[in-house]
């Protein structure tokens, strides 16, 4: 299993939307992709989960664009706020 986030940093003005990309590889049939936000304290905050055979996930300002065949799962954060400034991680799990 492998997860790749090619964007090292992104800068975007408030109130705009940003899309963070994540590519993965897996041999699992059934899996989840999780998106987390890391606080300055290093604490990880769960944001949203995408199931491998589910429709695109959405939760508040967070939405996922899931391309299963391409093994791509992008997180879009809309209406950006200053407190969205952070490090974001995607993770793969069964």
């Amino acid at each position: 299993q492998k997860v790749t986030q090619a964007q090292s940093s992104v800068s975007m003005p408030v109130r705009k939307a940003v899309t963070l990309n994540c590519l993965y590889e897996t041999s699992w049939w059934s899996y989840y992709i999780f998106w987390y936000k890391q606080l300055p304290s290093k604490e990880m905050i769960f944001l949203i989960r995408q199931g491998s055979d589910e429709q695109n996930a959405k939760s508040g300002r967070y939405s996922v664009n899931f391309k299963k065949a391409a093994k791509s799962v992008a997180l879009t954060i809309s209406a950006l706020q200053l407190e969205d400034s952070a490090k974001y991680f995607c993770a793969l799990g069964e």
Epitope: W29, E54, Q55, K67, K68, A70
Partner: antibody, heavy 118, light 106 residues
């Protein structure tokens, strides 16, 4: 509204190649993969493969590797499938279809009928 | 890849009758999707994620199941329901379809 407009019926000779097209409208083309399916009376519906128009990343059913080549043109919002070394076994109706995440296929083109005959 | 087996291949029913068609998967899947196809037309999404009716599908249709066994039921068949119904899964790496159940009205 979402529409997938496929090219017209084709009659081609054995051994030749053909390219089928699928023009998407009513949504942002690069936000969704485009998949292709083959339908015949004998084998029913068979998944051929898919392309991510944004990146060009493709995935194929092993059965159709070397037979089908998927491409996409972002500027015209059109997906293409080239079928090579055609035989009578390739005679079928081909559909381009758009998935909803990793779930089902919510939009289908009207289909292109391919007939391979000498 | 996961093989989907649909039964019966042909289902004959009278208007008003209750009918059930089944789809069995060679391995366990999380969801099953169903499509309706009439001659000369593309398949239409009919039931998705096992039990959710697609837009415009009459409430007499329902879907159920889990694991390797799924079904589509019509509570009271109407003439317009005559069509072929296909099941589809995408729990494995590639989508697969069943061979279809053709519903004929007497």
């Amino acid at each position: 509204q979402v529409q997938l407009q496929q090219s017209g019926a084709e009659l081609v000779r054995p051994g030749a190649s053909v390219t089928l097209s699928c023009k998407a409208s009513g949504y942002t083309f690069v936000d969704y993969e485009m998949h292709w399916v083959k339908q015949t009376p004998v084998h029913g519906l068979e998944w051929i493969g898919a392309i991510d128009p944004e990146t060009g990343i493709t995935a194929y059913n092993q059965k159709f590797k070397g037979k089908a080549t998927l491409t996409a043109d972002k500027s015209s919002s059109t997906a293409y499938m080239e079928l090579s070394s055609l035989t009578s076994e390739d005679s079928a109706v081909y559909y381009c279809i758009r998935p909803r995440g990793g779930s089902h296929f919510d939009y289908w083109g009207q289909g292109t009928t391919l007939t391979v005959s000498s | 890849q996961i093989v989907l087996s649909q039964s019966p291949a042909i289902l004959s029913a009278s208007p008003g009758e209750k009918v059930t068609m089944t789809c069995r998967a060679s391995s366990s899947v999380n969801y099953m999707h169903w499509y309706q196809q009439k001659p000369g037309s593309s398949p239409k999404p009919w039931i998705y994620a096992t039990s959710n009716l697609a837009s415009g599908v009459p409430a007499r249709f329902s879907g159920s199941g889990s694991g390797t066994s799924y079904s589509l039921t019509i509570s009271r068949v109407e003439a317009e329901d005559a069509a072929t119904y296909y099941c589809q899964q995408w729990s494995s790496h590639q989508p697969t379809f069943g061979a279809g159940t053709k519903l004929e009205l007497k």
